[in-house]
Amino acid sequence: EQAPGTAPCSRGSSWSADLDKCMDCASCRAAPHSDFCLGCAAAPPAPFRL
């Protein structure tokens, strides 16, 4: 359960201070220095290729 007033981001996303909204952590692979990537706990899995 989240504490009152915490960022309402779901698993796999992180709050962007610049955009004032939650962003998908998967995009941090391409743009790792985006502000919200600081809040992405684990590296997203590499895309599966045959």
Partner: antibody
Amino acid sequence: QVQLVQSGGGLVKPGGSLRLSCAASGFTFTSYAMSWVRQAPGKGLEWVSAISGSGGSTYYADSVKGRFTISRDNPKNTLYLQMNSLRAEDTAVYYCARVRANYYYGMDVWGQGTLVTVSS
Amino acid sequence: LTQSPGTLSLSPGERATLSCRASQSVSRLTWYQQKPGQAPRLLIYGTSSRATGIPNRFSGSGSGTDFTLTITRLEPEDFAVYYCQQFRNSLLTFGGGTKVEIT
């Protein structure tokens, strides 16, 4: 209990190098971003650097970019700050801190601080 | 981030109002307390949410570029330096601090 224990400070000559360490315990280290903040004697707080939980994203203040490197060893629950090309103005107490992304990037747990003195 | 006043001289029981002004619009602000020889302590996050264990005499408010930390009735242990902090453009930034001292 949740704590951060720092080590590695000391006296270094201008142009020299030093590595600070911050050992974390009492929480799942990989789940949190971490940061370094410094405070020159008698001055205010200055953010230095931050790193994501995975270590894949790093951030630096302009004043240290290209000279300092933040890193983390998640299996060892340890955060590092490698400081190169040190200058007199880098003299400060350095703190490591846990960053809470869901607290809008507030820092809720702090180390005890370690003094870095750059002087000839 | 610009904090004002630089020093606030008050007596225990009085109300303290600390200001933090940003040069550009900020979505959320954080406040810390620091006592001499100690590490900073998180007080307020997300502009107005109190951190764990922080008494309700501390409150934060504001939006855009103007933010305020209010201490309704100063206790002896509240005399310290207070810092605001933002996260913008992938940079964490602190204000210069406001010292709340006993008059």
